[in-house]
Interface confidence: low
């Protein structure tokens, strides 16, 4: 999906008002310096591409974040403010329903959400490079 035509300011507002705090809630009890940043992004569409990938794509050691509160709100924000995004996610949603809900927060998931926090911060900056 091409995130170029999203309403970035509306997505930023959604992040500031709620998604940011949901990410922090998920990370509660984890020291802010425990993980090194390994994922970056250069402009807002790129940031959203990376955010979507880390939030909704299963990775080794972290099967699914998609049912977490921050993920559901991220999905809603993208669906509302990125034209055509919902249509591209129908297959992904069906697959997501088949996964079991994560019972424990693995260290890999914490690391992944830490990366998400960094990506969101870069997205949130108004003067991103190459934008």
């Amino acid at each position: 999906y091409d995130f170029t035509n999203c309403d970035f300011e509306k997505i930023k507002a959604a992040y500031l008002s709620t998604i940011s705090k949901d990410l922090i809630t998920y990370m509660s009890g984890t020291k802010s310096t425990e993980f090194n940043n390994t994922v970056s992004c250069s402009n807002r569409p790129h940031c959203l591409t990376e955010i979507q990938s880390l939030t909704f794509n299963p990775t080794a050691g972290c099967a699914s974040l998609a049912k977490e509160m921050f993920a559901m709100k991220t999905k809603a924000a993208l669906a509302i403010w990125c034209p055509g995004y919902s249509e591209t996610q129908i297959n992904a949603t069906q697959a997501m329903k088949k996964r079991r809900k994560r019972k424990v927060t693995t260290n890999k998931c914490l690391e992944q959400v830490s990366q998400l926090q960094g990506l969101w911060r870069r997205f949130n900056r108004p003067l991103l490079k190459q934008q």
Epitope: S20, K21, I24, Q117, G118, R121, R125
Partner: antibody
Framework: QMQLVESGGGVVQPGRSLRLSCAAS????????MHWVRQAPGKGLEWVAV????????HYADSVKGRFTITRDNSKNTLNLQMNSLRAEDTAVYYC???????????????WGQGTMVTVSS | SYVLTQPPSVSVAPGQTARITCGGN??????VHWYQQKPGQAPVLVVY???DRPSRIPERFSGSNSGNTATLTISRVEAGDEADYYC???????????FGGGTKLTVL
């Protein structure tokens, strides 16, 4: 251990310039956003400026915009504040502070220097 | 620009609970950080992201944030807690850091 050490303070006449430096050690300087915060005698904390971890962006308080310039040299682990056209109201203790911008959703200063005094007086 | 309002002073007896407030328009939608500053010393972060505490800070320090008010709570206050306390946010609309005016905590 992790520390920030400011230098360059002193007494200067109004309209003149001064350059403050902050030497960082004990941590990965290049991964942190860096700020200057000042405190006038008997007053509260006032934020002055920020520079991102990679130096790509800077922001300034309205009271210093156009007069102060924040820079960093990640190869030398140093932060600088060039202060031009100084005024009496710039008299304060100047602190450098780091903010782990990749991890907190909004800047929080988890390490401060001891401060350096700048006095602007004729 | 965004404004944070703190009471100039708060007094509390040793062993009691001190509550220092920080008011701002819809501050609950922002992340609030709190600093302790003792005379002649640099500030020290005591609470960040509304309610998280750096590892070296005692559990007696806690924070909350909702609506138009953030609160720093210090339980079982000790004489050593006497200091100035500042709240702080990042104002995303201006890309400025904003500090409250500070609150002097006096332990009676």
């Amino acid at each position: 251990q992790m520390q920030l050490v400011e230098s360059g303070g002193g007494v200067v006449q109004p309209g003149r310039s001064l350059r403050l430096s902050c030497a960082a050690s004990g941590f990965a300087f290049r991964t942190y956003g860096m700020h200057w915060v000042r405190q006038a005698p008997g007053k509260g904390l006032e934020w002055v400026a920020v520079i991102w971890d990679d130096g790509s962006n800077t922001h300034y308080a309205d009271s210093v915009k156009g007069r102060f310039t924040i820079t960093r040299d990640n190869s030398k682990n140093t932060l600088n504040l060039q202060m031009n056209s100084l005024r009496a109201e710039d008299t304060a203790v100047y602190y450098c502070a780091r903010a782990p911008q990749w991890y907190l959703s909004a800047e929080a200063f988890d390490l401060w220097g001891q401060g350096t005094m700048v006095t602007v007086s004729s | 620009s965004y404004v944070l309002t703190q009471p100039p002073s708060v007094s509390v007896a040793p062993g009691q609970t001190a509550r220092i407030t920080c008011g701002g328009n819809l501050i609950g939608s922002k992340l609030v950080h709190w600093y302790q500053q003792k005379p002649g010393q640099a500030p020290v972060l005591v609470v960040y992201d509304d309610s998280d505490r750096p590892s070296r800070i005692p559990e007696r320090f806690s924070g909350s944030n909702s609506g138009n008010t953030a609160t720093l709570t210090i339980s079982r206050v000790e004489a050593g807690d006497e200091a100035d306390y500042y709240c702080q946010v990042w104002d995303h609309s201006s890309d400025h850091v904003v500090f409250g005016g500070g609150t002097k905590l006096t332990v009676l």
